[in-house]
């Protein structure tokens, strides 16, 4: 697994460098998670043809994966810093159950899957420190999440592979949108 942000050899070699600002740390954390997702997607796509054929193979997708919409204030048009930050944190909290599902879904990238999960928890903490309106952030219900996890794990092999692909693709898109938005803040 890649080394978490702040622990790479460049940091060790440059002890006199200015410490990262909160925004820089968040930016770096997201890019680190995106690298991890990239590695996981590589394994998923190599294992099956899910990545090319998901459009034709699926008629309907009812996985309620977080997605950015106009009303969330994260796009350039209608940008709203506070609304957007709440959406990013809420979305990441909602993704956590899906990241838990990804554990044990990888053979050669098991550590990578764990790193993505743990780094996301750290990212949420960074963002919560940045947010002024923490009351607006709704935390998913643990009982609902446990039931969702059980249902996801009960699917057959093909559906689980497809679910894995869809989670990684959506999480990547969500993080990319978050990164663009956070750079405007």
């Amino acid at each position: 697994a890649p080394v978490p942000p702040g622990e790479d050899s460049k940091d060790v070699a440059a002890p006199h460098r200015q410490p990262l600002t909160s925004s820089e740390r968040i930016d770096k954390q997201i890019r680190y998670i995106l690298d991890g997702i990239s590695a996981l997607r590589k394994e998923t796509c190599n294992k099956s043809n899910m990545c090319e054929s998901s459009k034709e193979a699926l008629a309907e997708n009812n996985l309620n994966l977080p997605k950015m919409a106009e009303k969330d204030g994260c796009f350039q048009s209608g940008f709203n810093e506070e609304t957007c930050l709440v959406k990013i944190i809420t979305g990441l909290l909602e993704f956590e159950v899906y990241l838990e599902y990804l554990q044990n879904r990888f053979e050669s990238s098991e550590e990578q899957a764990r790193a993505v999960q743990m780094s996301t928890k750290v990212l949420i903490q960074f963002l919560q420190k940045k947010a002024k309106n923490l009351d607006a952030i709704t935390t998913p219900d643990p009982t609902t999440n446990a039931s969702l996890l059980t249902k996801l794990q009960a699917q057959n092999q093909w559906l689980q592979d497809m679910t894995t692909h869809l989670i990684l693709r959506s999480f990547k898109e969500f993080l990319q949108s978050s990164l663009r938005a956070l750079r405007q803040m």
């Epitope: 699926l58 996801l152 009960a154 699917q155 057959n156 093909w158």
Partner: nanobody, 125 residues
């Protein structure tokens, strides 16, 4: 364990109609996505149609769109395939399938968990 049993197949002239039924023994029928597939000798199993849990969303292969209609009756644990304007190329063994996945509606056989034995449909010209 879910048992699926198709009926309604037979020999029909081109332009004619048939209605296939698939009865399920499972008590949780309404939680399954139901689909119809067909297969001709020496060819791969082909997707025909699928219907979501509630019956609100229906999907068809391009080759049958506008001619075939899928429906389900959750009270009777049965899914139907109404086939109109039949063509000789519709000749195949028709299989009913159930997918227990609670989130995705697949168009490929690997996404389905349970299969019926199949019913022969022959369309003569």
């Amino acid at each position: 364990q879910v048992k699926l049993e198709e009926s309604g197949g037979g020999l029909v002239q081109a332009g004619g109609s048939l209605r296939l039924s698939c009865a399920s023994s499972g008590r949780t029928f309404s939680s399954y996505v139901m689909g119809w597939f067909r297969q001709t000798p020496g060819k791969e199993r082909e997707f025909v149609s699928t219907i979501n849990w509630s019956g609100s969303n229906k999907y068809y292969a391009d080759s049958v769109k506008g001619r075939f209609t899928i429906s389900r009756d959750n009270a009777k644990n049965t899914v139907y395939l109404q086939m109109n304007s039949l063509k000789p190329e519709d000749t195949a063994v028709y299989y009913c399938a159930a997918s227990a996945g609670g989130f995705l509606v697949p168009r490929v056989g690997q996404g389905y968990d349970y299969w019926g034995q199949g019913t022969q449909v022959t369309v003569s010209s």
